[in-house]
Structure formats: C-alpha cells, structure tokens
C-alpha cells in the first residue's frame, strides 16, 4: 500500500491521543534506554510503511502484536485516514485469523514495540529541513 495520500495530521492526532497511551501501557516497566532503534524512516509515508510492517507482520519471536490494543487502533486510524487502505487489508486479515495464537509478551515483542515507538516518534515530528 502507498501511504502518500493519507491524512497525516489526523493520524498524528490519533497517535498522540490514543495509540501512544496503549504503547505506554504495553511498554510499562521497560526502560526507554533498554533497546536501541535499528529501524528508521525518512518521511511520513515511509514511516507508516515501516509502522505497518512492524505492527502487523509476525516476526520470529513475536507473532502476536496485531491483536494488541495499539495495533487495533493503528489499523483503525489507517483505515479511516488512508484512502483505499481497508481494501488492501482484507486478505491480510483473513490470513491473520488462520494463524491466531495466544498473547505472549516476549522480550522480542518488547524490542519490536520499542522500534515502533521510535518510528512513531519520527512520524510525529513535523518536517525538518536538511542543513
């Protein structure tokens, strides 16, 4: 999906008011310095691409993020504020239902959410001009 035509300000507002709070809850008890960011993004569409990938694509050691509250709210925000996003996700959702596993917060998941935190932080910044 191409995130270029999303309403970034509306997604930013959704992140600040709700998604961030769920990330805070998920990461509670974890030091902000515990994990270093290894995933970055260069502009808002790129940030959303990386956020979608980390939130909804299962990875080794962390298969369950898509069912977390922050993930559901992320999905809702993208569906509302990115034209045509919902249609692209129908097949992905059906695939997710087939491999549903019980929720387990592993260290790998905490690391992945820490990466998400960094991507959202970068998305949240207004455009910075290069020197």
């Amino acid at each position: 999906y191409d995130f270029t035509n999303c309403d970034f300000e509306k997604i930013k507002a959704a992140y600040l008011s709700t998604i961030s709070k769920d990330l805070i809850t998920y990461m509670s008890g974890t030091k902000s310095t515990e994990f270093n960011n290894t995933v970055s993004c260069s502009n808002r569409p790129h940030c959303l691409t990386e956020i979608q990938s980390l939130t909804f694509n299962p990875t080794a050691g962390c298969a369950s993020l898509a069912k977390e509250m922050f993930a559901m709210k992320t999905k809702a925000a993208l569906a509302i504020w990115c034209p045509g996003y919902s249609e692209t996700q129908i097949n992905a959702t059906q695939a997710m239902k087939k491999r549903r596993k019980r929720k387990v917060t592993t260290n790998k998941c905490l690391e992945q959410v820490s990466q998400l935190q960094g991507l959202w932080r970068r998305f949240n910044r207004p455009l910075l001009k290069q020197q």
């Epitope: 600040l16 932080r121 949240n124 290069q130």
Partner: antibody, heavy 119, light 107 residues
Framework: QVQLQQSGAELVRPGASVKLSCKAS????????MHWVKQTPVHGLEWIGT????????AYTQKFKGKATLTADISSNTAYVELRSLTSEDSAVYYC????????????WGQGTTLSVSS | DIVMTQSQKFMSTSVGDRVSITCKAS??????VAWYQQKPGQSPKTLIF???NRHTGVPDRFTGSGSGTDFTLTISNVQSEDLADYFC?????????FGGGTKLEIK
C-alpha cells in the same frame, strides 16, 4: 540514566559569536531529536529550534533564524547551538532538552548555560 | 504561531489544598501538550506529557487533563516543595510554544 551535560557560563562581547554545547549520555543519541530553549525574565521560555542528530535536519522559530544555528556531532554525542552577532538581548539561560520517548513532548533537560553579553 | 495562554500569572494556595492551573491554546493542538515545573535556580522538570501522562517519578498528586484547546494541571494535596513556576508547552506544530508560566505561592 539519561543525562544532558551543558557547557559552562559564557561572558562575551557584543557582536561576537558563541557556541554552546550539550553532551548526551545514557541513551542512543541518534534516536531522539534535540531541542534548544532560551529563558529570560522578560520573555520567559522560548523554543529556539530542534535538530535530528541522525539526519542533521533542523527547524527554527522565525525569530531565531539567522541568529542560531543548531548542529550535532554523533561521534561525541554532542549537540551545539551557535549564536552570532550577539547583543544584550541574547543574554539568557539556554537549555538543551531531549525529545520524549513517545514524541509530542520533551522530557529530559540540561542544567542550562548562562550567556552574558556585555562590553 | 500557536499562542499558549496561562491567564493566572500567580496563584496562592495552602499546604493540603487542591489547585488547578490552566492553559489555553489559540488553535487545536489535540493532546500535544506537556507541563513543566521549574523551581528557583533549577532547570525545568517534566511533570505531564501528552496532556495526561505522568512522567517517570512524578508524584500522583500531579494530574493533567484536556485536549484540543483547553488544558489543566491539577495538584491535589499541595506540598511546600510544590512552590515553583509551572509552564505548559504545545508540541503539535513548529514552532513549539510555551505558556507564560504560573507562579505557585504557598500561604
């Protein structure tokens, strides 16, 4: 733990330039934007601008464009603000402050650097 | 630029009381507001971020509320060590802007 260590007080002549530093420790320097804030009794707290250490990208308040230049050295985890063509109006306490973990706020503050511009 | 107005420059309260400090934005800043406490001779300290989240180590007598244009910092059971200046800051759009501050005095 996160620490922002700022350079010591400066006394400089009008018309000169000065470069204030802020050494970061306890976190990954390139992961967080750094902000600079000016404080005077008259104007209170004023946001000067921000820099993304990873890209060197910056943003400034209009008032400080041409007055302040923000840079960052990732080899030493240090952010800088250079102030030029100094006048008595630039006398203030200058703070560096780090972008918050979740964005949309700043969390940790340096101890401040007092700049006095006087002939 | 977004203007952040703290209409009360000074507030006087007694130990044990509850006090509310307000901040009004000139346009919608959603929940991108933080509150800071500054004691004499010290750098500011973060109290509340994203309008209602307490920063690490901040006592739970400090609470933040609001969204859009109206924000409130409430201190319940005021202690003598709460004597300080309190500032709001909007971080929705560059340039970020501070409120003028509210000085809390203890009777």
């Amino acid at each position: 733990q996160v620490q922002l260590q700022q350079s010591g007080a400066e006394l400089v002549r009008p018309g000169a330039s000065v470069k204030l530093s802020c050494k970061a420790s306890g976190y990954m320097f390139t992961d967080y934007a750094m902000h600079w804030v000016k404080q005077t009794p008259v104007h209170g707290l004023e946001w000067i601008g921000t820099i993304d250490p990873e890209t060197g990208g910056t943003a400034y308040t209009q008032k400080f464009k041409g007055k302040a230049t923000l840079t960052a050295d990732i080899s030493s985890n240090t952010a800088y603000v250079e102030l030029r063509s100094l006048t008595s109006e630039d006398s203030a306490v200058y703070y560096c402050t780090r972008e918050g973990s979740y964005g949309g706020y700043v969390d940790y503050w340096g101890q401040g650097t007092t700049l006095s511009v006087s002939s | 630029d977004i203007v952040m107005t703290q209409s009360q420059k000074f507030m006087s309260t007694s130990v044990g009381d509850r006090v509310s400090i307000t901040c009004k934005a000139s346009q919608n800043v959603h929940t991108a507001v933080a509150w800071y406490q500054q004691k004499p001779g010290q750098s500011p300290k973060t109290l509340i971020f994203l309008a209602s989240n307490r920063h690490t180590g901040v006592p739970d007598r400090f609470t933040g509320s609001g969204s859009g244009t109206d924000f409130t910092l409430t201190i319940s059971n005021v202690q003598s060590e709460d004597l300080a200046d309190y500032f709001c800051l909007q971080l929705w759009n560059y340039p970020y802007t501070f409120g003028g501050g509210t000085k809390l005095e203890i009777k």
